[in-house]
């Protein structure tokens, strides 16, 4: 078993729809064909998934389990998308990544991605 | 509280079949990733299947991959483990898991049922 | 697989006593590491995660320590409801396998 190292940025703001986008970089030491990729929330001291991939190096990035999640994969890159947040989803978010196939088993855990999610405010009701 | 409510252990033959059934309560069933775990009599802890939250990933060790399936119902508040081509080797109590995330941001088994022993035997 | 070795297997002790039960990992598994206790005829309850956290409930007297190898769980004073079997279970990669166990008796 390996360590590796994962980068992600330290501040993501969510876009006013409730959107927010953030690379997950890991530096793979071996020739990796099976990585897992889950996104973790942690809160206070609660850690809650967010949503986990499995993908073969080279194909599509596919989040099952009715994700509220997207992403892509490019090299040792996976590309993130989170939707539907709201201002109570603001928390860090932790990028965990291991290289599953072949062995050795290599994990890897970013720092975490404080997101910042602020509810739009209402339209004002207007009499024109 | 949390209640993992293990069924459908029995006696059966070499090469027999069986499912179990765990049936969970006290927690939002959906959220979290379950596992089983087994006991053979007087020995020692065996991890056996792991399934993702909605069912999407599962797990197996090599001594049970291709022979037991982990499933879940998520609408019925259940887990499943069908076993297929029993052996003698299999007979054990059978422990299904519930899995937290601690601080480390990695799996433990936090909540255990009572176990379900499954026999097999000529 | 990372075999996860225990020492000793079985113990004798008092009640009042300090023990420490060790767990050994085949190769470094960082502090990715858990206690369990099982009683006779019931579920194994988890004691102690990441190799020093206390798990819910459970009472201060059990510590855990180590990282990369070598584990240690200690019980600073032992109270009768203490008398059972441990196991060390590492959780870093797959599979997740678990020590053979300590049998904690009384003397």
């Known amino acids: 078993c390996k360590a590796m190292h994962v980068a992600q940025p330290a501040v993501v703001l969510a876009s006013s729809r409730g959107i927010a986008s953030f690379v997950c970089e890991y530096a793979s030491p071996g020739k990796a064909t099976e990585v897992r990729v889950t996104v973790l929330r942690q809160a206070d001291s609660q850690v809650t998934e967010v949503c986990a991939a499995t993908y073969m190096m080279g194909n599509e990035l596919t989040f099952l389990d009715d994700s509220i999640c997207t992403g892509t994969s490019s090299g040792n890159q996976v590309n993130l998308t989170i939707q539907g947040l709201r201002a109570m989803d603001t928390g860090l978010y932790i990028c965990k990544v291991e290289l599953m196939y072949p062995p050795p088993y290599y994990l890897g855990i970013g720092n975490g991605t404080q997101i910042y999610v602020i509810d739009p405010e209402p339209c004002p009701d207007s009499d024109f | 509280e949390v209640q993992l409510v293990e069924s459908g252990g029995g006696l059966v033959q070499p090469g027999g079949s069986l499912r179990l059934s765990c049936a969970a309560s006290g927690f939002t069933f959906s959220s979290y990733t379950m596992s089983w775990v087994r006991q053979a009599p007087g020995k020692g802890l065996e991890w056996v299947a792991t399934?993702?939250?909605?069912?999407?990933?599962?797990s197996y060790p090599d001594s049970v991959k291709g022979r037991f399936t982990i499933s879940r119902d998520n609408s019925k508040n259940t887990l499943y483990l069908q076993m297929n081509s029993l052996r003698a080797e299999d007979t054990a109590m059978y422990y299904c898991a519930r899995e937290d995330y601690g601080s480390s941001y990695v799996h433990w088994f936090a909540y255990w049922g009572q176990g379900t022993l499954v026999t097999v035997s000529a | 697989d990372i075999q996860m070795t225990q020492s000793p297997s079985f113990l004798s002790a008092s009640v009042g006593d300090r023990v420490t039960i060790t767990c050994r990992a085949g190769e470094n598994i960082y502090s990715y590491l858990a206690w369990y206790q099982q009683k006779p005829g019931k579920a194994p309850k988890l004691l102690i995660y990441?190799?020093?956290t206390l798990a819910e409930g459970v009472p201060s007297r059990f510590s855990g320590s180590g990282s990369g190898t070598e584990f240690t769980l200690t019980i600073s004073s032992l109270q009768p409801e203490d008398f059972a079997t441990y196991y060390c279970q590492h959780h870093y990669g797959s599979p997740r396998t678990f020590g053979g166990g300590t049998k904690l008796e009384i003397k």
């Open positions: 990441n190799a020093r």
């Open positions: 399934i993702s939250r909605g069912g999407g990933y599962t």
